[in-house]
Amino acid sequence: MNGRVDYLVTEEEINLTRGPSGLGFNIVGGTDQQYVSNDSGIYVSRIKENGAAALDGRLQEGDKILSVNGQDLKNLLHQDAVDLFRNAGYAVSLRVQHRLQVQNGPIGHRGEGDPSG
């Protein structure tokens, strides 16, 4: 019997200061570039080593970015989302959704990764 995969979803406000080489990450997604099935949201696909996001440490690959400086990223074309980040100024506030995978064992059994054993 296989374990069930669940996800723990949390939201966080991350304030980044643009560094000498920018914010230091890549994105995928948009209404014209659906990276996740049935979801046109914007996702972090890469965090650049020693970039502003990496040095801050909170933004992770796979995070969904919900808004930039209070502006919702829903229903945006991919390039429009890119441009929004590029024009976001020196201090950039990101509302992000982290999705942590949680592996559960079969019912009645403790999962391998369960720390309470």
Partner: nanobody, 125 residues
């Protein structure tokens, strides 16, 4: 992990043409930013051209002579090189990164790319 395989290099006379190909593994190829770099003996690796979701970018030295294009159905990016010059002689490398950088004008930086091919030699005499 993304694997890149280049082909199409060779020797050509000045003024001639070559077309390089780079085929990538991965099911989300259309989201990759793809680029070509080159390295001549004793020189730094140099940006040639890149293509992202939003368009193509070129080094000044190749603008008007080289054209980068992609076929997402074939997971392949091409570099059409026309009016070749002896100074174009180098090993040409294909590079890839998933997604688009949110930082302006970073497309020509080798540090922006996570995956690299083995390279293909181009010699112009």
């Amino acid at each position: 992990h993304v694997q890149l395989v280049e082909s199409g290099g060779g020797s050509v006379q000045a003024g001639g043409s070559l077309r390089l190909s780079c085929t990538a593994s991965g099911r989300t190829f259309s989201t990759y930013t793809m680029a070509w770099f080159r390295q001549a003996p004793g020189k730094e690796r140099e940006f040639v051209a890149a293509i992202s979701w939003s368009g193509a970018y070129y080094a000044d030295s190749v603008t008007g002579r080289f054209t980068i294009s992609r076929d997402n159905a074939k997971n392949t990016v091409y570099l059409q090189m026309n009016s070749l010059k002896p100074e174009d002689t180098a090993v040409y490398y294909c590079a890839a990164v998933i997604g688009s950088t949110v930082d302006s004008y970073r497309t020509g930086d080798p540090l922006e790319y996570d995956y690299w091919g083995q390279g293909t030699q181009v010699t112009v005499s």
